[in-house]
Interface confidence: low
């Protein structure tokens, strides 16, 4: 006969980064024991194993160690799967296959979603605007999934559909950044609204911009930033300093402050119309509101990531305007190297051994140096590889091949060129024959 396996009909909707439960249940017969149970979760399309329970034991996750069963509930027929730290790539169908004496299976769909950020609005050109000018308004919203629907309307709520170009680009995590561009001819003034809708979450994020043609600026504001790059450790907060000299009688209502990425012109943070308009950069930026009136336009960037590295432009407009760019150099210290030996037992003088030095999660790429016990550099037969993880941090693996003497010490030094931080490890090989690591 067939075992009845039950799963929800509707897709399970899970936010990126959260945990999801894929429900699956069966009805155990009286006297059922877990020793009889074979439970397999697999990807429906590819049949790739995700998680299994067999021979009375949880066989563990075969899916990047992000899955778990509910062991205390299995005996009651609860075969549900917990999927941790959901990613876009997890989206799809999962099959729950239960076998006792009989067997049955059913498939449950996982729909991944991520909310879009509040849109940021930029204007091009953004000065010397007069009625009749054609302007380009860009509405940008970040890190959502799945692809968004974008709607424009004017101040009266009338939809604007002509001259709209929308592009959506997925990042390495599969999340979308949406950029929608509206081209309009200015009236005396006007309000333009952009709405970004997530079709799965039915979440709307909207922003608007009101354009009032302005008179031409007459001179330049001197904007000062540090000449040297600001060095920030991954995960810490960084201050990008920027200052200007306010004139007597200056009021914040006169100030337009924009921080943007120098290369892409992506808006990072803005202060306009006497108000902090907030972060357009993953909600990780802040100004120093109490210091703005004194001419301090610095930007605080929180939880620095490798991807933040680059140049940021501070743009200040009062009656006049000026701008300057500051560079952010991101860094992360390398871990103390771990050393491994191959082969690692029955070693004798004259044997060729491979010593591997591994150091993790540093940035930028490391410099690796080997030396012997006398401090003499070892450069021959060294192969070093560096691989970036999803956060852009590097794991470095350096392999040294040497012919053993009677004994010897081999040291590996991993240097972070930005932090001027050295991390080193060494291994001493003595005696014959020997085993590494030494047995207790």
């Amino acid at each position: 006969g067939a075992l009845e396996v039950q799963v929800p009909e509707d897709p399970v909707v899970a936010l990126v980064g959260t945990d999801a439960t894929l429900c699956c249940s069966f009805s155990p017969e009286p006297g059922f024991s877990l020793a009889q149970l074979n439970l397999i979760w697999q990807l429906t399309d590819t049949k790739q194993l995700v998680h299994s329970f067999a021979e009375g034991q949880d066989q563990g996750s075969a899916y990047a160690n992000r899955t778990a069963l509910f062991p205390d509930l299995l005996a009651q027929g609860n075969a549900s799967l917990r999927l941790q730290r959901v990613r876009v790539a997890d989206e799809g169908s999962f099959t729950c296959f239960v076998s006792i004496r009989d067997f049955g299976s059913a498939a449950v769909s996982l729909q991944v979603a991520a909310p879009y950020s509040k849109p940021s609005m930029t204007l091009e050109p953004n000065k010397d605007l007069r009625p009749g000018d054609t302007v380009t308004i860009t509405c940008s919203s970040y890190q959502g999934y799945p692809e968004a629907e974008v709607f424009w309307q004017d101040g009266q709520g009338v939809p604007l559909t002509g001259n709209v170009t929308t592009s959506q680009m997925a990042n390495e995590q599969g999340l979308f950044d949406v950029h929608s561009i509206l081209r309009v001819v200015l009236g005396a003034n006007g309000t333009y609204s952009c709405l970004v809708r997530n079709p799965v979450l039915q979440q709307d994020a909207h922003s608007s911009v009101t354009i009032t043609p302005q008179r031409s600026p007459t001179g330049a504001v001197e904007v000062q930033v540090p000449e040297d790059p600001v060095v920030a450790l991954v995960g810490t907060d960084a201050t990008l300093r920027c200052s200007f000299s306010p004139e007597p009688g200056f009021s914040l209502a006169q100030l337009n402050l924009i921080w943007q990425l120098t290369d892409t012109k992506q808006l990072v943070h803005s202060f306009t119309e006497g108000r902090d308009q907030g972060s357009a950069y993953a909600n990780r930026t802040a100004l120093f509101p109490d210091l703005l009136a004194q001419g301090n336009a610095s930007l605080r960037l929180q939880r620095v990531r490798v991807a933040d590295e680059g140049s940021f432009t501070c743009f200040v407009s009062i009656r006049d305007f000026g701008s300057a760019a500051v560079s952010l150099q991101v860094a992360a210290p390398y871990s103390k190297p771990s050393m491994t030996l191959e082969p690692n037992k029955d070693l004798r003088p004259g044997d060729t051994v491979t010593i591997t030095c591994s150091s993790y999660r540093g940035y930028p790429e490391a410099e690796v140096f080997w030396q012997d016990g006398q401090g003499v550099p070892l450069t021959g037969n060294v192969t070093t590889s560096q691989m970036a993880n999803e956060q852009g941090l590097f794991d470095v693996h350096s392999v040294l091949r040497v012919v053993l003497g009677a004994n010897g010490t081999y040291s590996c030094l991993v240097r972070n060129p930005v932090l001027q931080q050295d991390a080193h490890g060494s291994v001493t090989i003595t005696g014959q024959p020997m085993t590494f690591p030494p047995e207790a």
Partner: antibody
């Protein structure tokens, strides 16, 4: 029936550019990941670049900054724009479909390939 | 990147014999390994994925095994059409997706 047909190969000089096309039929190109895989004469297979169903692009280190993968959903075609070509880029270039939306997977369908020769 | 090493480079056998092809990964790739067959002048053809699962239309004489770093493709009772080059490919750690150097199975 799923089919992939590559075109655009030919003989070029070092430093020149070439664009390869891969016309797909039997499936929607933005519902699956598709990659370019190359094979130098008498050598093994080397993955070059991939684009996922959602549009994420990846490149091998050997071509990063020189090659650009793209697709046109309206005509179900994949492209590989190859700039600054080198002699070591000489190979048969295959278009290969992954059997799911994310590109990091095995390839269940392959085209017949198109030969690119870079020679002075 | 994950390096895949295939051995032997060439395997010389007679029809009806069993072929055992090895693929070793430089670090664990769990079961994210596929095998392909390629004949001269043709594109590769998928044989096995997820280490053990035969692709559609692949005869039962082809089987895969292994996990972690050691993988094997076995062809029981070689047929004349099985003489070709075989490649393994990992899709666990990426980018890049990587292939082994290939094993040529030729007729004795």
């Amino acid at each position: 029936d799923v089919q992939l047909v590559e075109s655009g190969g030919g003989v070029v000089r070092p430093g020149e550019s070439l664009t390869l096309s891969c016309a797909a039929s039997g499936f929607t190109i933005n519902s699956y990941a598709v990659s370019w895989v190359r094979q130098a004469p008498g050598e093994g297979l080397e993955w070059v670049s991939g684009i996922s169903g959602s549009g994420v692009r990846y490149y091998a280190d050997s071509v990063k900054g020189r090659f650009t993968i793209s697709r046109d959903n309206s005509n179900n075609t994949l492209y590989l724009q190859m700039n600054s070509l080198r002699a070591e880029d000489t190979a048969v270039y295959y278009c290969a479909r992954s059997n799911k939306v994310t590109w990091n997977n095995f390839f269940d369908y392959w085209g017949l390939g198109t030969l690119v020769t870079v020679s002075s | 990147e994950v390096v895949l090493t295939q051995s032997p480079g060439t395997l010389t056998l007679s029809p009806g014999e069993r072929a055992t092809l090895s693929c070793r990964a430089s670090r664990s790739i769990l079961t994210s390994l596929a095998w392909y067959q390629q004949k001269p002048g043709q594109a590769p053809r998928l044989l096995i994925y997820n280490t053990v699962t035969r692709a559609t239309g692949i005869p039962a004489r082809f089987s895969g095994s292994g996990s972690g770093t050691e993988f094997t493709l076995t062809i029981n009772s070689l047929q004349s059409e099985d003489f070709a080059v075989y490649y393994c490919q990992q899709y666990y750690d990426w980018p890049p997706l990587t292939f082994g150097g290939g094993t040529k199975v030729e007729i004795k």
